[in-house]
C-alpha cells in the first residue's frame, strides 16, 4: 500500500503519500482553531505508470493507454485513498470546544 | 456537476471530463474483444483551483493551502467521479460471450 509506512521510509518516485505540514493561520487564514496550530496533512504526488496501485478498471485501462500513447495528456493521477480525522479545539467566545474534523489527514494514495 | 452534459458543451479550462476514444487493438493491444472495436472512455483533465468541485474536506483544505501558497506542488487533482460499465462481446473459441466490464467509462470528474 502507498501509505505513510512505505512512502515516508522510501525514495519512491511514483505515486506516494508525501509529507506536508499545514499551519492553520499562515496557510489557510484560519484564526478560529485554537489547538493544534497546524497539522501533518500530507499529500499525494508522483506519476502513475501502468500497474502502479491502480484504483479501478478504468485507471488500469488508462494507464495501459498511456503506455501505448506516451505523449497523451490522458493519464491516471495520484490522489488520496485513506483519509483520517483531526481532533481540534476551538473557542466559542471564552468557552473551549473539541471537534473532530473528518477527512483531514492523508494516510495513503492511489492512482485514479 | 462536471459531467459529459456540461463539459462536452463548454470550453471549460478547469477540471472537467474530456472526450477520449480508445481503440482496443491500437491503444491497448487487446485482441480478445470482438465488439466493440473501441469505445468512448473519456478522461479527466484541468486544474483544480479553490472551490472547483472539491471532493472531501481534505481537498478543500489543500486547495485553500494552494491559494495561499501558489508555488506549492501539493494540489488537488482532477479524477473520475462517476464511472459506467461497458458491454462487450468476446469469443471463447467459436462461442460468443457477452460481458459487462465495470468502471470503464468516465461520466463525470471531481477534484480529489
Amino acid at each position: 500500500a502507498l501509505d505513510t509506512n512505505y512512502c515516508f521510509s522510501s525514495t519512491e518516485k511514483n505515486c506516494c503519500v508525501r509529507q506536508l505540514y499545514i499551519d492553520f493561520r499562515k496557510d489557510l487564514g484560519w484564526k478560529w482553531i485554537h489547538e493544534p496550530k497546524g497539522y501533518h496533512a500530507n499529500f499525494c504526488l508522483g506519476p502513475c505508470p501502468y500497474i502502479w496501485s491502480l484504483d479501478t478498471q478504468y485507471s488500469k485501462v488508462l494507464a495501459l493507454y498511456n503506455q501505448h500513447n506516451p505523449g497523451a495528456s490522458a493519464a491516471p493521477c495520484c490522489v488520496p485513498q485513506a483519509l483520517e480525522p483531526l481532533p481540534i479545539v476551538y473557542y466559542v467566545g471564552r468557552k473551549p470546544k473539541v471537534e473532530q474534523l473528518s477527512n483531514m489527514i492523508v494516510r495513503s494514495c492511489k492512482c485514479s | 456537476a462536471l459531467d459529459t452534459n456540461y463539459c462536452f458543451s463548454s470550453t471549460e479550462k478547469n477540471c472537467c471530463v474530456r472526450q477520449l476514444y480508445i481503440d482496443f487493438r491500437k491503444d491497448l493491444g487487446w485482441k480478445w474483444i470482438h465488439e466493440p472495436k473501441g469505445y468512448h472512455a473519456n478522461f479527466c483533465l484541468g486544474p483544480c483551483p479553490y472551490i472547483w468541485s472539491l471532493d472531501t474536506q481534505y481537498s478543500k483544505v489543500l486547495a485553500l493551502y494552494n491559494q495561499h501558497n501558489p508555488g506549492a506542488s501539493a494540489a488537488p487533482c482532477c479524477v473520475p467521479q462517476a464511472l459506467e460499465p461497458l458491454p462487450i462481446v468476446y469469443y471463447v473459441g467459436r462461442k460468443p460471450k457477452v460481458e459487462q466490464l465495470s468502471n470503464m467509462i468516465v461520466r463525470s470528474c471531481k477534484c480529489s
Partner: antibody, heavy 120, light 108 residues
Framework: QVQLVQSGAEVKKPGSSVKVSCKAS????????ISWVRQAPGKGLQWVGG????????NYAQRFKGRVTLTADTSTNTVYMELSNLRTEDTAVYYC?????????????WGQGTLVTVSS | ETVLTQSPGTLSLSPGERATLSCRAS???????LAWYQQKPGQAPRLLIY???SRAPGVPARFSGSGSGTDFTLTISSLEPEDFAVYYC?????????FGQGTKLEIK
Amino acid sequence: QVQLVQSGAEVKKPGSSVKVSCKASGYTFSSNVISWVRQAPGKGLQWVGGVIPIVDIANYAQRFKGRVTLTADTSTNTVYMELSNLRTEDTAVYYCARTLGLVLDAMDYWGQGTLVTVSS
Amino acid sequence: ETVLTQSPGTLSLSPGERATLSCRASQSLGSSYLAWYQQKPGQAPRLLIYGASSRAPGVPARFSGSGSGTDFTLTISSLEPEDFAVYYCQQYADSPITFGQGTKLEIK
C-alpha cells in the same frame, strides 16, 4: 473589495420556512466565519448564529436552536440561513456579516440585509 | 446570557461637541470581547471598535473605545454631522453574542 450580497425580500406565512442566501466576494471565503444577525422593525440587533465554511461547524443562539440551519457552500462562496416554523415575531431584516476570524467575534463586513415578513 | 445596558438611551449634542456613550455588562467580559457599531437608518451596522479599544480600518481617529470588565465607553472627541446615528455595543465573550439596546445620538 469585500462584499456580501444577500437574496431579496421574502413574504411568508406562519408555520412555513424561509431560506436566505449571502454570497461573499473580494476575500478568501473559507478563512472567515459568517454570522447572521436580525433586526425587527424599529428594534435592536439580535444574533442568530454563525457558521464556519469548509468544515460546516455551526453555532446557534439557544432561542433559535431547532428552527435555524446555517450552511456554507464553498463552491459558490455562499452561506445560507434557513429558518423554519416561522412566527409573526420573526419579521425582521436578516443580515449576514463576516467576523474578524473567531467563532464569536466582532463583524467587519455586513450584507445589505434581507427583509423577511411573516404574515397570514 | 450576558445583558448589555447602554446609556443614555438618547444623547442630544451639537456638532463639535464631545460624545460619551456607556455600555455596562451584566457579567465581566475581560478586556477584549467588546465591539461598537454605528447604524444609520436603512443601512447595515458599521464596525467602529473591536477588542474594546481597537479602531476598525477606515474609522476616523475621533472615535475611541475604552474600558474592561463590565464598564465600557465609546468616545467621539468632536462630533461631525455624519456621526448622528444609533450606536450599539456588542459582546462576544460568551454565547450567544448579545447587543445593547442602542444609544441614539441626535443633533441638538
